[in-house]
């Protein structure tokens, strides 16, 4: 992470993407340590904007405003040089979010993908954004940036992610920026969880009292495996959300979760997946599909006693 020979390394914590009102620490790492340093903001003229102030270890900026967005550099203290200061550091871009209406983020073909596949994340808005930025939660690298394409009063950008592997799973958000203010970003899109399946052994899925039930009869779907999964996810074909439950160790050394579906009203095809707490967005292979059939008088919906997860939240730990 060190800079070149006489070049400090400027970094931001916790992130270079900071919401309005948030705080960020700028750290200038120079010659195996944090020495005194000066900060510059590249606003046309390359002059210290901090009134010649000298900082030690880090400079905390905040509550940040749109004016804080931009490119920063630092110079480390070099007492025995001609100028007393090092060469300028790497440029560090600080992006301030929350300045325009949020864009929308969609996954094509969908947010549940097999390892090795490619997904297109489309960020779009009716605000005429010049650039779109895609950011994965928990990643300190700068967001990916694309120029927005404008068609029929909508600006959009397609981010291609893949081939998918565990490190690319997670919660994504996108932002937009308007011309002349490239680092003053919009509010974030609603979060979108990208889940990668097919990494571990498939669990088995069964129905109690059985896969064919009378209308009104209570049905429970059990997902189990010899693998020590922490969480099981149950999905129903044609439904956008999944249900999840904590796995419980059983006396026969399997790990199981029982999903009560309540009184049967109509059937459907179900699948379940297992995942580990450490990697909540990386799932097992799908169980074999289980077709639940209801005999009698079907109605249009099946109540959900287990609370469905929202479009996002899959990649959060289940506490």
């Amino acid at each position: 992470l060190m800079g070149g020979q006489d070049k400090p390394f400027l970094s931001a914590r916790p992130s270079t993407v900071v919401p309005r009102g948030g705080h960020v620490a700028l750290q200038c790492h120079y010659r195996r340590g944090f020495n005194n340093f000066m900060l510059y903001k590249e606003d046309r003229s390359h002059v210290p904007i901090f009134h010649g102030r000298i900082f030690q270890e880090s400079f905390i900026m905040g509550p940040v405003t749109p004016a804080h967005a931009g490119t920063y550099r630092c110079r480390g203290s070099r007492p025995h040089s001609l100028t007393g200061w090092s060469a300028p550091s790497n440029p560090l871009v600080i992006m301030v979010t929350g300045n325009h209406r949020k864009p929308s983020l969609l996954a094509h073909p969908g947010p549940l993908l097999k390892s090795g596949e490619t997904v297109i994340l489309q960020c779009w808005s009716d605000v005429m954004f010049e650039h779109f930025f895609l950011h994965r939660e928990g990643i300190s690298e700068d967001p990916s940036r694309l120029v927005g394409q404008i068609h029929d009063g909508v600006s959009k950008a397609n981010f291609s992610i893949g081939p998918l592997m565990p490190v690319l799973a997670g919660t994504y958000r996108c932002y937009g920026s308007v011309p002349h203010s490239p680092y003053q970003l919009s509010a974030p899109s609603d979060p979108l969880d990208i889940v990668i399946t097919g990494l571990y052994e498939k669990p088995s899925l069964s129905a109690q009292p059985g896969p064919t039930v009378q209308a009104g009869e209570n049905v429970t779907l059990s997902c189990s495996s010899w693998s020590s999964y922490d969480i099981y996810h149950l999905s129903r074909e044609g439904e956008a959300h999944e249900r999840r439950l904590r796995a419980v160790p059983k006396v026969n050394r399997t790990f199981q979760a029982d999903f009560p579906l309540g009184p049967a009203t109509h059937g459907g095809t179900y699948r379940c997946f297992g995942s580990f707490r450490a990697l909540p967005c990386v799932w097992s292979n799908s169980s074999d599909p289980l077709l639940v059939s209801v005999t009698g008088n079907p109605s249009s919906s099946w109540p959900s006693p287990t609370e469905p997860s929202s479009k996002s939240g899959i990649c959060r730990h289940l506490h």
């Epitope: 900071v18 919401p19 309005r20 948030g22 705080h23 960020v24 905040g62 509550p63 929350g98 928990g138």
Partner: antibody, heavy 120, light 107 residues
Framework: QVQLQQSGAEVKKPGASVKMSCKAS????????MHWVRQAPGQGLEWIGY????????ENNRKFKDKTTLTADTSTSTAYMELSSLRSEDTAVYYC?????????????WGQGTTLTVSS | DIQMTQSPSSLSASVGDRVTITCRAS??????LAWYQQKQGKAPQLLVY???NLADGVPSRFSGSGSGTQYTLTINSLQPEDFATYYC?????????FGGGTKLEIK
């Protein structure tokens, strides 16, 4: 020691305006942002907005954007909040609070609160 | 805007008990979280900042933990003066929203 002294209780009629104050002492007024928080009777706390007394920069919770005006007088180390077009729903205790320093700062000092009653 | 979900909304306990209050953020707030105690008719008082740091003068029976989206305030060995309402608040971008509060009552 740090103190935030707020102005006294106010009773106003619907449609009127009110300007409450928060006088800071015991620290450099321009080095910290001043925030305002409201608490309706029997309810929780709501962040209204803040002012940076050094620059005059203000930011408001969207919910209160057309309701509040935040100002500061650096010569007297006093922050002000004006509430306009008062309605009975604005009846609440209003607190000023100083945002501390550091990377993860909290509201480290609070005023004692100004009670506003809006009634016809 | 970031939502803060605090639970439980009320809690009955006895002197000497250990109680836990949780606060869940709708997104990662990077430990930008404070806990406050408020007694009837008084201004809130800071207990914990940066999720885990105890404010000056706060008794060591109070402790904060958590990271990411999930945070906890724990009070060990409740004292009579601890019966009050507790609020969490995030600082990761405006608006700095508060949790709904937890009223801690004597059993």
């Amino acid at each position: 020691q740090v103190q935030l002294q707020q102005s006294g209780a106010e009773v106003k009629k619907p449609g009127a305006s009110v300007k409450m104050s928060c006088k800071a002492s015991g620290y450099t007024f321009t080095s910290y942002t001043m925030h305002w928080v409201r608490q309706a009777p029997g309810q929780g706390l709501e962040w209204i907005g803040y002012i940076n007394p050094s620059s005059g920069y203000t930011e408001n919770n969207r919910k209160f954007k057309d309701k509040t005006t935040l100002t500061a007088d650096t010569s007297t180390s006093t922050a002000y909040m004006e509430l306009s077009s008062l309605r009975s729903e604005d009846t609440a205790v209003y607190y000023c609070a100083r945002l501390g320093k550091g990377l993860l700062p909290p509201f480290d000092y609070w005023g004692q609160g100004t009670t506003l009653t809006v009634s016809s | 805007d970031i939502q803060m979900t605090q639970s439980p909304s009320s809690l009955s306990a006895s002197v000497g008990d250990r109680v836990t209050i949780t606060c869940r953020a709708s997104e990662n707030i990077y430990s930008n979280l404070a806990w406050y105690q408020q007694k009837q008719g008084k201004a809130p008082q800071l207990l914990v900042y940066a999720a885990t740091n105890l404010a000056d003068g706060v008794p060591s029976r109070f402790s904060g933990s958590g990271s990411g989206t999930q945070y906890t305030l724990t009070i060990n060995s409740l004292q009579p003066e601890d019966f009050a309402t507790y609020y969490c608040q995030h600082f990761w971008g405006t608006p700095y929203t508060f949790g709904g509060g937890t009223k801690l009552e004597i059993k």
